[in-house]
C-alpha cells in the first residue's frame, strides 16, 4: 500500500499556503482527486509529489494515491481543508445527475472542519427541503440525499453557520432521472387498415416512457412523415402521439406504415399495412376440404374464413339436405374475429346422426354482395352383413348383402364345425369377391353390395361365413346348415344364424 507524507488523515491549511503531498510506493504511483486549479505534479519513479504554492478553498478535497501495478489495488488518502473565512464551501459540481432510488451526493465540501456542527441543506432562496427528504452529511464528501426521488429534482444550497450567520454555497442542481427500463412502449392503431378509394382513414402512432427524453416518428414506406406531435403526461408516463388523418385515400397512400420510438436505451418499432381497394370485397375460404367424410357418431367442426371490407351485414349456416329440412342449431354456430377484416365462422356438429349427412352452406353478405361456401358431408358406416340361402337358375346359392360406407369388400370363408365366426384353425377354404355387385350407391347414403357363392352341396357340420370390411370396420354373418342331404333344400329347412 502506498504511503502519503504528511502521514495524517486530514490536513488543515490557510489560503495562500504551500501544500506538498508526497506519495511513495513499491512501484510507480499516481495521484487522484477532484480537478482543481494550481496543482503541480512531479513524478520520480516510485514517488509522486502533488504540490501547490498558492492553496485556495478550491483545493479542498480528498486526494488519493494508488499504485497501478498493485494487483490488490491498495490506496492511501489524505483530506485537505483550505480554511477560508470567506468561503466555507468548496462545491465540486454544478449539477448532480442520478437515477431514482440512488443516493444523491451533493458535493459541498466544508473548507473548515470546525463548521460541521452548524451545517444544513436547503433549497435555493431559503426554501425548506421537501417533506420526507432523508439526508446525511460528511465534511469530506458533502450532503447525501438517500434514495432520491424524481420529485426531488431541485436546486439546492449548502448552509454553514459562521459567526452566528448562515453562509450559503453556490447552488447545485439535482436531476433525478427515472429509471428507463428500455426503449419507449409503442402502439400503432389500427394494426391493419383497409379502405375503399375516396374514404377517410386515420392512423395513430403513440409512444410512452417514464422519461421525457425520447423521440417518435411515423414513416410510410421508409419516408418519415411530418406530423404535428401531441404530448401528454398521465399515469406517471410521458406520452407522444402522432395522428395521420387522410380525408380521401388513394392508392398512393397504401403500403407499410412504421411507428418508431427511441431513447438512450434503444429503439422500438412496430408496423402495419394499409390497403386501398377499388371496391368492397367479400372472400370465403376454408382450410378444410369442402368434401368431408366422418364416421357416424363422431363430431365435426366446419370452419369458414371470411375476408371482407366493409364489415359483414349478415351471415348464416344452412343445411341443404337431402335427409330432412332441419337447420343447424344457432348455438352450434360460432364466430371469432381474427382481426378487423378476417373472421372465422365455425359450425359444430357433435355426434353425427345418419340424417345429418348432406350439404351445409355458409352464406355471408356485405355491401360487395352475397357469397356462399358449401361443404358436402358424407358419413362413414361400418358394414352390416346378412346372408340368405336361395336358388338361382336352379343352383343352390348363398347370397350375402353388405351395406356401409365406404363401399365394403367381401370375403367368403368355409370352415369346419358350427361357429359364429370362423377362426384361422378351422378355415377350409377362402374366396375373395373382388367385384361384388353394387345394388345402391346414392350420394350421402350407404353403399350396398351383393356377393353370390354357388354351393352344389351344403356340407354337414360346416359353417359358411360372409365377411365384409371397409376403412371404418368390419361385419360378418355365419350361415350354418342344420342338416345335410340332397343337393337342394328349400330355405325354410335351414336355420339362419346372424
Amino acid at each position: 500500500i502506498p504511503v502519503i507524507e504528511p502521514s495524517v488523515p486530514e490536513l488543515v491549511v490557510k489560503p495562500g499556503a504551500t501544500v506538498t503531498l508526497r506519495c511513495v510506493g513499491n512501484g510507480s504511483v499516481e495521484w487522484d482527486g477532484p480537478p482543481s486549479p494550481h496543482w503541480t505534479l512531479y513524478s520520480d519513479g516510485s514517488s509522486s509529489i502533488l504540490s501547490t504554492n498558492n492553496a485556495t478553498f478550491q483545493n479542498t478535497g480528498t486526494y488519493r494515491c494508488t499504485e497501478p501495478g498493485d494487483p490488490l489495488g491498495g490506496s492511501a488518502a489524505i483530506h485537505l481543508y483550505v480554511k477560508d473565512p470567506a468561503r466555507p464551501w468548496n462545491v465540486l459540481a454544478q449539477e448532480v445527475v442520478v437515477f431514482e432510488d440512488q443516493d444523491a451526493l451533493l458535493p459541498c465540501l466544508l473548507t473548515d472542519p470546525v463548521l460541521e456542527a452548524g451545517v444544513s441543506l436547503v433549497r435555493v432562496r431559503g426554501r425548506p427541503l421537501m417533506r420526507h427528504t432523508n439526508y446525511s452529511f460528511s465534511p469530506w464528501h458533502g450532503f447525501t440525499i438517500h434514495r432520491a426521488k424524481f420529485i426531488q429534482s431541485q436546486d439546492y444550497q449548502c448552509s454553514a453557520l459562521m459567526g452566528g450567520r448562515k453562509v450559503m454555497s453556490i447552488s447545485i442542481r439535482l436531476k433525478v432521472q427515472k429509471v428507463i427500463p428500455g426503449p419507449p412502449a409503442l402502439t400503432l392503431v389500427p394494426a391493419e387498415l383497409v379502405r375503399i378509394r375516396g374514404e377517410a382513414a386515420q392512423i395513430v402512432c403513440s409512444a410512452s416512457s417514464v422519461d421525457v427524453n425520447f423521440d417518435v416518428f411515423l414513416q410510410h414506406n421508409n419516408t418519415k412523415l411530418a406530423i404535428p406531435q401531441q404530448s401528454d403526461f398521465h399515469n406517471n408516463r410521458y406520452q407522444k402521439v402522432l395522428t395521420l388523418n387522410l380525408d380521401q385515400v388513394d392508392f398512393q397512400h397504401a403500403g407499410n406504415y412504421s411507428c418508431v420510438a427511441s431513447n438512450v436505451q434503444g429503439k422500438h418499432s412496430t408496423s402495419m399495412f394499409f390497403r386501398v381497394v377499388e371496391s368492397a370485397y367479400l372472400n370465403l375460404s376454408s382450410e378444410q376440404n369442402l368434401i368431408q367424410e366422418v364416421t357416424v357418431g363422431e363430431g365435426l367442426n366446419l370452419k369458414v374464413m371470411v375476408e371482407a371490407y366493409p364489415g359483414l351485414q349478415g351471415f348464416n349456416w344452412t343445411y341443404l339436405g337431402p335427409f330432412s329440412d332441419h337447420q343447424p342449431e344457432p348455438k352450434l354456430a360460432n364466430a371469432t374475429t381474427k382481426d378487423t377484416y378476417r373472421h372465422t365462422f365455425t359450425l359444430s356438429l357433435p355426434r353425427l346422426k345418419p340424417s345429418e349427412a348432406g350439404r351445409y352452406s355458409f352464406l355471408a353478405r356485405n355491401p360487395g354482395g352475397w357469397r356462399a361456401l358449401t361443404f358436402e358431408l358424407t358419413l362413414r358406416y361400418p358394414p352390416e352383413v346378412s346372408v340368405i340361402w336361395t336358388f338361382i337358375n336352379g343352383s343352390g346359392t348363398l347370397l350375402c348383402a353388405a351395406s356401409g360406407y365406404p363401399q365394403p369388400n367381401v370375403t367368403w370363408l368355409q370352415c369346419s364345425g358350427h361357429t359364429d365366426r370362423c377362426d384361422e384353425a378351422q378355415v377350409l377354404q377362402v374366396w375373395d369377391d373382388p367385384y361384388p355387385e353394387v345394388l345402391s350407391q346414392e350420394p350421402f347414403h350407404k353403399v350396398t353390395v351383393q356377393s353370390l357363392l354357388t354351393v352344389e352341396t351344403l356340407e354337414h357340420n360346416q359353417t359358411y361365413e360372409c365377411r365384409a370390411h371397409n376403412s371404418v370396420g368390419s361385419g360378418s354373418w355365419a350361415f350354418i346348415p342344420i342338416s345335410a342331404g340332397a343337393h337342394t333344400h328349400p330355405p325354410d329347412e335351414f336355420l339362419f344364424t346372424p
Partner: antibody, heavy 117, light 110 residues
C-alpha cells in the same frame, strides 16, 4: 490499460438531441473523473464537461444550458446529451479520463457526429 | 476562437530541434500548470507532457516542456518523421473553472 469506446448515432437532425455513450473497459469507472471533449473538423479541442462516478457534473459555461451528463456505474458507462443541436455542433466527440493536475491520460478513439437534415 | 494561442504551423527537418509556443493569460497559464497533447493523423490526442514538464511513461525524452509567466513551450529535439502531427497545449482556466486548449499547431517534418 484503460480503454474507452464512444458510441451513438453518427447523424443528428438540427434541433434534435445528440446522445452519446462512453463505455469504460479494463478498469473501473468509480473514483475517477470522466470528460467529454469535442473537435470540429480542422479545428482545436473544446472541453464540454466532466462527470464523477457519484453523478457530480461540471460543464463548460458556453454549453451548460444544453448539456446533461449521466453515469451508470453498473454498466461502467457515462453518457452525454446535447440538446437543440445545430451544424456548429458537428465534430468528433471524444471521451477521456481526467486526472488531478488537469490532464487527460486516456482517450476514446472518437466518434464523428454530423448535424444535418 | 481558442483561449490559448498557438502558431497554426511549424516545421523542421529530421534531427532538428523545433519549439512550439503557447500563450495564455493570468487566469490559465499564469496560475496553473500546462499540459501538451500529440494528435497523429486520424487518431485521438495522446498525453505528451503534464504539469509543465513531466513526461508520462513511454514518451521519449526528446520531448520537453517549460513554462514562464503566461506562456509555455514544447520542444522536440532530434526531430523524426513520426513526430509529424498536431500538437495542443492545455491548462486549467480559473474563470472557466475547467480546462482550456490551444488551437493546435500542425508540425511538418520536411
Amino acid at each position: 490499460q484503460v480503454q474507452l469506446q464512444e458510441s451513438g448515432p453518427g447523424l443528428v437532425k438540427p434541433s434534435e438531441t445528440l446522445s452519446l455513450t462512453c463505455t469504460v473497459s479494463v478498469g473501473s469507472i468509480s473514483s475517477y473523473y470522466w470528460s467529454w471533449i469535442r473537435q470540429p473538423a480542422g479545428k482545436g479541442l473544446e472541453w464540454i464537461g466532466r462527470i464523477y462516478a457519484s453523478g457530480s457534473t461540471n460543464y463548460n459555461p458556453s454549453l451548460k444550458s444544453r448539456v446533461t451528463m449521466s453515469v451508470d456505474t453498473s454498466k461502467n458507462q457515462f453518457s452525454l446529451k446535447l440538446t437543440s443541436v445545430t451544424a456548429a455542433d458537428t465534430a468528433v466527440y471524444y471521451c477521456a479520463r481526467e486526472r488531478v493536475g488537469i490532464y487527460f491520460d486516456y482517450w476514446g478513439q472518437g466518434t464523428l457526429v454530423t448535424v444535418s437534415s | 476562437q481558442s483561449v490559448l494561442t498557438q502558431p497554426p504551423s511549424a516545421s523542421g527537418t529530421p534531427g532538428q530541434r523545433v519549439t512550439i509556443s503557447c500563450s495564455g493569460s493570468s487566469s490559465n497559464i499564469g496560475s496553473n500548470t500546462v499540459n501538451w497533447y500529440q494528435q497523429l493523423p486520424g487518431t485521438a490526442p495522446k498525453l505528451l507532457i503534464y504539469s509543465n514538464n513531466q513526461r508520462p511513461s513511454g514518451v521519449p525524452d526528446r520531448f520537453s516542456g517549460s513554462k514562464s509567466g503566461t506562456s509555455a513551450s514544447l520542444a522536440i529535439s532530434g526531430l523524426q518523421s513520426e513526430d509529424e502531427a498536431d500538437y495542443y497545449c492545455a491548462a486549467w482556466d480559473d474563470s472557466l473553472n475547467g480546462p482550456v486548449f490551444g488551437g493546435g499547431t500542425k508540425l511538418t517534418v520536411l
